[in-house]
């Protein structure tokens, strides 16, 4: 099949006290190899921070996948989630506190 | 057939820098990552640093201060520059594809390497 | 950064014997752990990526296994071919970091 570009979509949700968790999902694409990883201040996290879903088929013959991370609360704009598929690539902020979903479809 | 090549001086001075070139085929620079690893004679392998696809780059922070990485993607190269030498840099450099799929990290096609000599 | 410590500097084995390599970190690493192989002549192969999985083109000879921060490699049955440094890698942490490696010789 040809390329289908993911949708990306950040999202926080509370953790702890002082703590959110950041989650970056991605989307309706193929084929299934896609790079997800958090940067903080542009340097990748580690591993033993992050936790990823497996990439799973979604039911149109594209897949889906996600990575999450724990974060102070305040430090959002520290954060991107980048994404890497098929020779494309892009970077994705956290959403501010008053705003929760943020989409985007890459071509 | 994914394919790397590094290409380095051979030899270099105390204090002074070192620039080599892997030069890649059979894949894109702008959807890999590229690693650089380095092996001093008898001893094991030492990760330096990588530049992903986008150009964003992760460093060593014990060699951080001394390195640049960087590419042409147009070229299908990637360079890596290491300043103010010493004789304990002498080592096999080698560069590596980087496959970063969720929890596998792994460097899946390496380069022949080269050797560097730091010597007066 | 995370210390991988390969005790056994060498080995000497028989042709068809069944040899295990074994390696430890300095803390517990998640089955973030690969295996290369290093030929006398200087050329790296990945064997094995996330504890166990096998690359394509690998020998089923070869297999892997550990959990928390103890991993070992294993020759089912040793060819003339294997002969060769074997290195262990975590990538929990940044950085990555390597074990000093095991060479594997014919008795």
């Known amino acids: 099949g040809s390329t289908v570009p993911p949708m990306v979509n950040v999202t926080r949700s509370e953790a702890s006290e002082g703590n959110i968790t950041v989650t970056c999902r991605a989307s309706s694409f193929y084929p299934r190899n896609i790079i997800l990883t958090w940067r903080q201040d542009g340097v990748s996290l580690s591993h033993d921070t992050q936790q990823w879903g497996d990439v799973l088929p979604d039911g149109n013959g594209t897949y889906q996948t996600w990575v999450a991370t724990r974060i102070c609360r305040g430090e959002e704009q520290r954060f991107t989630c980048y994404m890497e598929h098929s020779g494309n690539h892009s970077t994705h902020p956290v959403p501010s506190g008053n705003s929760h979903h943020h989409h985007h479809h890459h071509h | 057939q994914v394919q790397l090549k590094e290409s380095g001086p051979g030899l270099v001075a105390p204090s002074q820098s070192l620039s080599i070139t892997c030069t890649v085929s059979?894949?894109?620079?702008?959807?890999?990552?590229v690693n650089w690893v380095r092996q001093p004679p008898g001893q094991g392998l030492e990760w330096l640093g990588m530049?992903?696809?986008?150009?964003?780059?992760d460093y060593n922070s014990a060699l951080k201060s001394r390195l640049s990485i960087s590419k042409d993607n147009s070229k299908s190269q990637v360079f890596l520059k290491m300043n103010s030498l010493q004789t304990d840099d002498t080592a096999r450099y080698y560069c590596?594809?980087?496959?970063?799929?969720?929890?596998?990290?792994?460097?899946?096609?390496w380069g022949a390497g080269t050797t560097v000599t730091v010597s007066s | 950064d995370i210390q991988m410590t390969q005790t056994t500097f060498s080995l000497s084995a028989s042709l068809g014997d069944r040899v295990t390599i074994s390696c430890s970190a300095s803390q517990g690493i998640n089955n973030y752990l690969n295996w290369y192989q290093q030929r006398p002549d200087g050329t790296v192969k990945l064997l094995i990526y996330y504890t166990s999985t096998l690359p394509s083109g690998v020998p089923s000879r070869f297999s892997g296994s550990g959990s928390g921060t103890d991993y070992s490699l294993t020759i089912s049955n040793l060819e003339p071919e294997d002969i060769a440094s074997y290195y262990c890698q975590q990538y929990s942490k940044l950085p990555p970091t390597f074990g000093g490696g095991t060479k594997v010789e014919i008795k």
């Open positions: 530049i992903w696809g986008d150009g964003n780059t």
């Open positions: 059979g894949f894109s620079l702008t959807g890999s990552g």
């Open positions: 590596a594809r980087g496959a970063h799929y969720g929890k596998r990290w792994y460097f899946d096609v």
